[in-house]
């Protein structure tokens, strides 16, 4: 594959992964009601980072958030950070990895400078994703405790009443925020790892000579010395790139010669 | 104004089908769940059936399952209740109800009478 | 099921007494999501419909007047009428609006003495 196809590859796969963060963040359906012992409930709980909502069978949604801080869950208030900490190494990735496409030219900014960038997204997009994915591991653990001990319950709680009365204890399982959570901080570490071994392809190897451009008077043509086997694809920056009259153009555009760095 | 007429009441025979419809105007009728109550003569009331908005969960009363069917068509504004293999203990008056917050029946029609005897 | 008992099946009262009726579910009908009780309360005219007079146990349904007045918790709820006037004379039902199968209550028939 080569560095530019690894490059936006991993690009896209952590903007989809980055996007997955956001709604997995922002989902109501974190925790739902678990409806093993009451499969026909006219009445749906579901909970979210955020909020938590009643779903009738009437079809009347009723959603609260959670107006207080200082009465929430430590695990829930970790979850929600870890959440908005990945989220926003997510955007500081986009932004930095645009910068460091090397499909896209920006003034005069060197390959080697490209290679820091894409390495330095790469990293932030994989510290998104496993930010992403032990949010999402530690909602489900916390999840999975409560629901073990609210069976427990169940079970123990029954003899207040002499066993008159039966009171419902509403369970929650795993809701649909979770799997995106976890396929979302997936993709973006994925994408992330793309984006660190594209930069590999992108570091100029000090042993490779500089590719020179060579102008021949009176013609607009760029002349490389064949015997070189020049163009290495990071060149020098003495290169002329406006020698044709495209205007501002992507470096694809120009053609160059394959190098062990073309190919990962 | 909210109104719902059912239709197709009427006396049969025990075994016998009869399809009972509830014709719904005055609201969005594919915005709400709908219901079917009965009522035996002199008796209270019991829930049949429940649709929900877009057709497709139904939940019944375990005296009617397997027997009765609900059913809406939307584009019709009309709610249906199929009911097969009728027995004398289904004579009742047969209400169709609009469900609202809560879960409550806030709109009733007047009902249909059906009779089954032999 | 959710079973729910009223009582009591029936009573008299003089105009403008109060009364109570009582609706006993044999589950909680609180849902812990929303902390709302899911019962609603029917009043039925001899010959007419049931009219809706209150749903999630306490919140009065637009048009009731206000001297009807629910509420209760859990499992045990109460619907009371603090004046009773000529018009209220009607068999009055409890529903579970909790769980399937929605359930009602067997009723309790309000007479003026």
């Known amino acids: 594959m080569s560095v530019t196809a690894c490059q936006g590859l991993g690009f896209v796969v952590s903007l989809i992964g980055f996007a997955g963060i956001i709604a997995a963040t922002c989902m109501d359906q974190w925790s739902t009601q678990d409806l093993y012992n009451n499969p026909v409930t006219a009445v749906f709980n579901y909970q979210g980072l955020w909020r938590s909502c009643v779903r009738e069978s009437s079809g009347f949604t009723e959603c609260r958030g959670y107006f207080t801080l200082l009465g929430l869950p430590a695990m829930l208030q970790a979850v929600r950070a870890l959440m908005i900490v990945g989220i926003v190494l997510g955007v500081i990735g986009i932004l930095v990895s645009i910068f460091a496409l090397k499909c896209i030219r920006i003034g005069s900014m060197d390959d080697s400078a490209k290679a820091k960038m894409t390495l330095t997204s790469g990293i932030l997009f994989i510290i998104s994703g496993i930010c992403a994915i032990i949010g999402v591991s530690v909602f489900a653990n916390m999840l999975v405790t409560n629901f073990w001990m609210s069976t427990a319950n169940m079970y123990s709680g029954m003899g207040g009443m002499g066993g008159m009365v039966q009171t419902v204890q509403t369970r929650y399982t795993f809701g649909a925020a979770l799997f995106v959570g976890w396929v979302a901080g997936g993709l973006t570490l994925i994408g992330g790892v793309m984006m660190c071994i594209a930069c590999r392809g992108l570091t100029p190897d000090d042993s490779n000579f500089k590719a020179v451009s060579y102008h021949a008077s009176g013609q607009n043509v760029a002349y490389r010395p064949g015997g070189f086997k020049a163009s290495t694809g990071f060149g020098s920056n003495t290169r002329n790139k406006k020698i044709y009259d495209g205007g501002a153009r992507t470096e694809d555009d120009e053609q160059s010669h394959p190098t062990k760095y073309d190919y990962v | 104004e909210v109104q719902l007429l059912e239709s197709g009441g009427g006396l049969v025979q025990p075994g016998g089908s009869l399809r009972l419809s509830c014709a719904a105007s005055g609201f969005t009728f594919s915005s709400y769940t709908m219901s079917w109550v009965r009522q035996a003569p002199g008796k209270g009331l019991e829930w049949v059936a429940t649709i929900i908005i877009g057709g497709s969960y139904t939940y019944y009363a375990d005296s009617v399952k397997g027997r009765f069917t609900i059913s809406r068509d939307n584009s019709k504004n009309t709610l249906y209740l199929q009911m097969n293999s009728l027995r004398a203990e289904d004579t009742a008056v047969y209400y169709c109800t609009r469900l609202v917050k809560g879960n409550a029946m806030d709109y009733w029609g007047q009902g249909t009478l059906v009779t089954v005897s032999s | 099921d959710i079973v729910m008992t009223q009582s009591p099946d029936s009573l008299a009262v003089s105009l403008g007494e109060r009364v109570t009726m009582n609706c006993k579910s044999s589950?909680?009908?609180?849902?812990?999501?929303?902390?709302?009780?899911?019962l609603s309360w029917y009043q039925q005219k001899p010959g007419q419909p049931p009219k809706l007079l209150f749903y999630?146990?306490?919140t009065r349904e637009s048009g009731v007047p206000d001297r009807f007045s629910g509420s209760g918790s859990g499992t045990d709820f109460t619907l009371t009428i603090s004046s009773v006037q000529a018009e209220d004379v009607a068999v009055y039902y409890c529903q579970n609006d909790y769980s399937y199968p929605f359930t009602f209550g067997q009723g309790t028939k309000l007479e003026i003495k």
């Open positions: 999630w146990a306490s």
């Open positions: 589950q909680s009908l609180l849902n812990s999501g929303n902390q709302k009780n899911y």
